[in-house]
Each structure stands twice: as C-alpha cells, then as structure tokens.
C-alpha cells in the first residue's frame, strides 16, 4: 500500500549536469540547459515528485509527473520509460506499481539520489546516450558507484 | 492565513479514551499528509502518528500503536485522534501538525496543541 | 523505531558559533535527505529552521545552517544571539513503519 504525503516541484539533473525535460514526443530526455534555457523550457523541465509513504518499511517512494497540457507520470510498465497520460493517485493498494519508484539518498554522497523500481527491485532510472540523444532509462544495477543511476534533485519552492 | 486549532483535550481516567480534533483553514487541507506529534511535560517531541492525504494510509509511533486511531475528513478540513486504553505515560500537549516534507512550497504548519492529562 | 541522538545540552557565548549533531540510522538520516530541524521556546509550538537537510525557509536566519555526512547531521548556530537560547530537535523521515522521528532535544543555553 502507498499512501501519497505530498508532492514538490524539482529539476532532475544527471551528474553531468543536464537537464531532465519531457520533449514535444512526451520522451523524457536530458540536455545541457543554461538556468535560463532551464526557465525557458519551463514546465517541460519542471517535474512534480509525489511523494508517498510505502505501508512495507521501504521508504520514501515517489511517483515523478509532469504538467503540460495535462498531467503525465512516468511508468516503468515492461521495464520501458514513458509519460503515461495520468494523475498520480491518493491511494495505492498495492506493494508494487509502475509509477512508484524508491528515492534514496547515494551512500557517501548525500546530495545525490537514486530511484529504484517498486515493480522491478534492482533496477534504477538512469541516463543513457543513444545515438545523439541522452535517455531516461530503466537500468539493472550492475556495478558500485554507477553514475548514470545517480542524479541531483533541486528544489523549485 | 495558515491556522490549525485543537480541541478535545482534558482530563480522563487511566484505562479511558478521548478523541482529538484539529480543524485547518489558510490551505489545501486535502494535499497533504498530516501528524500529531505529542511533548509530555518537560520532555521532548515525540511523533506519534500520521495520515497520508486521501486518508488510507495511516502510520503509528510504536508507543501508541494498537491504541491510538488517526483519520481524516477532507469534506470538513479536520483532522482527528482517537485514544483508547490510554496510560498515564500518554500524558502530553498534543499537536496538530502538517511537518516540513517537502519544504517552503507547502510550509510547516503546527497547532498551539491540547493538553491530555491521564490520571486516577 | 528509536529517536534520533542528540547532545542534551549544548553552550556558547554571544557571537560565537555552535554545532548541534544528530544521529541516526540508514533507515533514517542516513537514507534520506529529509531532515529538519525545530526550534523550540518555552510554552511555544516548534518553528522550521532547516529542512531538507540544508534549506532554510524564507524569515529564518541566515546564522542557522544545516549539514549532512552519513547517518549524522548537524546544525551550526553562528553569531549566537541571547534569543537563540531555546530547545532544539532534528527531525527525520523515517522507513520504519511510522512516518518521522523527532530527536531527543538539544538544550541551548547563552552564557
């Protein structure tokens, strides 16, 4: 069961310092982006974190939205990233979803944060180059200090 | 303005049981998870439960759980505690509060709180 | 679930500076950058200093600051002031089954 507490407005950035922003394909992408460039492409670079509380002693989980013309969450469903056309719910009665993921602080580096899948244990969101373009991914955690599982959460109050 | 008010506290017997109320305005009531949190005489904060924001999921201090029912009613912007089998070690203010989570955005909001005494 | 360590009393003389920590877990402190801290006086409701471990809300001064290394944090009070004399209690987002977890108090006193 998770039971949403409340939610925030953020900017997501990998550790190379781009910018998480949903595209004109609704495809969640990452960019280098001045804060300028940042406030420009506002809301498509503004996500709201929904945060809930999981009943299973697991911690903070989070279901990550975007409002556009209307609300889109991101999904996990088969281990494929997309913006799903949808309102995070109040409730939801259930131990795993494919809008929930895990947010935790990196051990060691307190001011980074990973999101793990509660569908999926030990996969995490990550950025992945593909060709030209830098991707939010669904990524099996294979190594220790991987980097393209660790991103920065900034507050926009 | 931002205004959580208490009531409901008193006096009871070792054994009974007393409902709190907190009534909220100045705010989106219904968006956030809310809290009581106690402070016995003298001593420190303690949490002691809370509410998710449509009310389903609820979370309980060890201290209290079993005993202690925390809920919710959106429509009337309340918030509620419901002590049962209650010990002269429940004795405290107790305060309506909707903590910090999340920051500036959505505030920390805190009651002037109620005092529960429980004695013979 | 346990309540995060704090010293239970700390001092400094005006215009000095001051470190409180608070200790916790990975289930706690240490998994989480949801930390606050309260600041309490006598007879009065807790006020927000810090939250999220390092953020000051807006009306609060810029002499209190906050940290994080581990499972502990830690407020710094500089240029301490009389009025800084209060009670003083950290706060966390916990995994546990319940929801937070208070500190057990900092008294501060201005000598």
């Known amino acids: 069961y998770f039971g949403k507490l409340e939610s925030k407005l953020s900017i997501i950035r990998n550790l190379n310092d781009q910018v998480l922003f949903i595209d004109q394909g609704n495809r969640p992408l990452f960019e280098d982006m001045t804060d300028s460039d940042c406030r420009d492409n506002a809301p498509r670079t503004i996500f709201i974190i929904n945060m809930y509380k999981d009943s299973q002693p697991r911690g903070m989980a989070v279901a990550i939205s975007v409002k556009c013309e209307k609300i889109s969450t991101l999904s996990c469903e088969n281990r494929i990233i997309s913006f799903k056309e949808m309102n995070p719910p109040d409730n939801i009665k259930d131990t795993k979803s494919d809008i929930i993921f895990f947010q935790r602080s990196v051990p060691g580096h307190d001011n980074k944060m990973q999101f793990e899948s509660s569908s999926y244990e030990g996969y995490f969101l990550a950025c992945e180059k593909e060709r030209d373009l830098y991707k939010l991914i669904l990524k099996k955690k294979d190594e220790l200090g991987d980097r393209s599982i660790m991103f920065t959460v900034q507050n926009e109050d | 303005e931002v205004q959580l008010v208490e009531s409901g506290g008193g006096l009871v017997q070792p054994g009974g049981s007393m409902r709190l109320s907190c009534t909220a305005s100045g705010f989106t009531f219904s968006e956030y998870a809310m809290s009581w949190v106690r402070q016995a005489p003298g001593k420190g904060l303690e949490w002691v439960s809370g509410i998710s924001t449509g009310g389903g999921g609820t979370y309980y201090a060890d201290s209290v759980e079993g005993r202690f029912t925390i809920s919710r009613d959106n429509s009337k912007n309340t918030l509620y505690l419901q002590m049962n089998s209650l010990r002269a070690e429940d004795t405290a203010v107790y305060y309506c509060?909707?903590?910090?989570?999340?920051?500036?955005?959505?505030?920390?909001?805190w009651g002037q709180g109620t005092l529960v005494t429980v004695s013979s | 679930q346990s309540a995060l360590t704090q010293p239970a009393s700390v001092s400094g003389s005006p215009g000095q500076s001051i470190t409180i920590s608070c200790t916790g877990t990975s289930s706690d402190v240490g998994g989480y950058n949801y930390v606050s801290w309260y600041q309490q006086h006598p007879g009065k409701a807790p006020k927000l200093l810090i939250y999220?471990?390092?953020h000051r809300p807006s009306g609060v001064s810029d002499r209190f600051s906050g940290s994080k290394s581990g499972n502990t944090a830690s407020l710094t009070i500089s240029g301490l002031q009389a009025e800084d004399e209060a009670d003083y209690y950290c706060?966390?987002?916990?995994?546990?089954?319940?929801?937070?977890?208070f500190g057990t108090g900092t008294k501060l006193t201005v000598l």
């Open positions: 706060s966390s987002f916990t995994s546990s089954s319940s929801l937070y977890v």
């Open positions: 509060a909707k903590p910090w989570l999340s920051g500036s955005r959505s505030g920390d909001f």
């Open positions: 999220e471990v390092s």
